[in-house]
């Protein structure tokens, strides 16, 4: 009856502001629909950050403006966070629903803490 | 700050219908699972149904399937219960509830609104 | 259908004394999905706990939650005054989400 998702511990952003990293979820039924939604904790607050449905099978779609991106294989979740800056380093969480068929599941990971380094201005160049 | 504020409780025959309301406020209304938790007098907390996000996936107790159904309208912010054939023993205090980032669990709750079934 | 036992059915303490409340779980659920409120008469309920052991947000640290798999436990470290009254336990990672049928706290 046990819903556990796994991600990992750290994760370091690129020098464009993009951090990938999987999320996996041992289901505990034959789930069609799945939402997946990414949380950021910093300072006790908790904020969503991005949230896809998907149809077991089909690929994650986000939103337009999302700044996440993602792809599903079976019971993995590969996401990719865009467009990030030192201030957004923090705590990313992400959570898995199993919406349809009956019964719901949730489960939710520990969280990937997201390092974010600002990238140093190029020297002025004479 | 969050306000959940019920409405449309009342007397009513068994066999007859009610529609109670749930006026939201203060989150973004779209990203938060609703729930209906009733209670009746002298009783425990009972869960009665839940409605997600942009309302396509829904589930109830038992005991109201079939005869409860649960909506929501996110342009308005607001969150209904139709309650058709009603029974004695569905007497209770309806409360709205938001659901959780973390969970199911709920962190804010209407004050509740009675729902009377007697003849 | 997960179900939910509290118990006792009934606690009467005094103020300043401990107390310890017990959830049992009919099945071990999901990674301690279990949450405790606390209700008074004419009132909603207000979240203690979630996640087991997380307090909620201006909970005072007398209250504490513990347990995994199926026994959970709400420990109040000193009782006041204003916490004598109902607490629900109620798991939430499965539906339907059930509570339990409460533990009354009330003045010995």
């Known amino acids: 009856k046990a819903m556990h998702v796994a991600q990992p511990a750290v994760v370091l952003a690129n020098s464009r502001g993009t951090a990938s990293f999987v999320c996996e979820y041992a289901s505990p039924g034959k789930a069609t629909e799945v939402r997946v939604t990414v949380l950021r904790q910093a300072d006790s607050q908790v904020t969503e950050v991005c949230a896809a449905t998907y149809m077991m099978g089909n690929e994650l779609t986000f939103l337009d403006d999302s700044i996440c991106t993602g792809t599903s294989s079976g019971n993995q979740v590969n996401l990719t966070i865009q467009g990030l800056r030192a201030m957004d380093t923090g705590l990313y969480i992400c959570k898995v629903e199993l919406m349809y068929p009956p019964p719901y599941y949730m489960g939710i990971g520990n969280g990937t803490q997201i390092y974010v380094i600002d990238p140093e201005p190029c020297p002025d160049s004479d | 700050q969050v306000q959940l504020v019920e409405s449309g409780g009342g007397v009513v025959q068994p066999g007859r219908s009610l529609r109670l309301s749930c006026a939201a406020s203060?989150?973004?209304?779209?990203?938060?699972?609703m729930h209906w938790v009733r209670q009746a007098p002298g009783k425990g907390l009972e869960w009665v149904a839940v409605?997600?996000?942009?309302?396509?996936?829904?589930y109830y107790v038992d005991s109201v399937k079939g005869r409860f159904t649960i909506s929501r309208d996110n342009s308005n912010n607001t969150l209904y219960l139709q309650m058709n054939s009603l029974r004695a023993e569905d007497t209770a205090v309806y409360y709205c509830a938001r659901g959780e980032f973390f969970g199911e669990f709920f962190d804010y709750w209407g004050q509740g609104t009675l729902v009377t079934v007697s003849s | 259908e997960i179900v939910l036992t509290q118990s006792p059915g009934t606690l009467s303490l005094s103020p300043g004394e401990g107390a310890t409340l017990s959830c049992r779980a009919s099945?071990?659920?999901?990674?301690?999905?279990l949450a405790w409120y606390q209700q008074k008469p004419g009132q909603a309920p207000r979240l203690l706990i979630y996640g087991a052991s997380s307090r909620a947000t201006g909970i005072p640290d007398r209250f504490s939650g513990s347990g995994s798999g199926t026994d959970f436990t709400l420990t109040i470290s000193r009782l006041e005054p204003e916490d004598f009254a109902v607490y629900y336990c109620q798991q939430y990672g499965t539906s339907p989400f059930t509570f339990g049928p409460g533990t009354k706290v009330d003045i010995k």
């Open positions: 203060g989150f973004t209304f779209s990203s938060f699972g």
């Open positions: 409605i997600w996000y942009d309302g396509r996936n829904k």
């Open positions: 099945q071990s659920f999901s990674s301690n999905y």
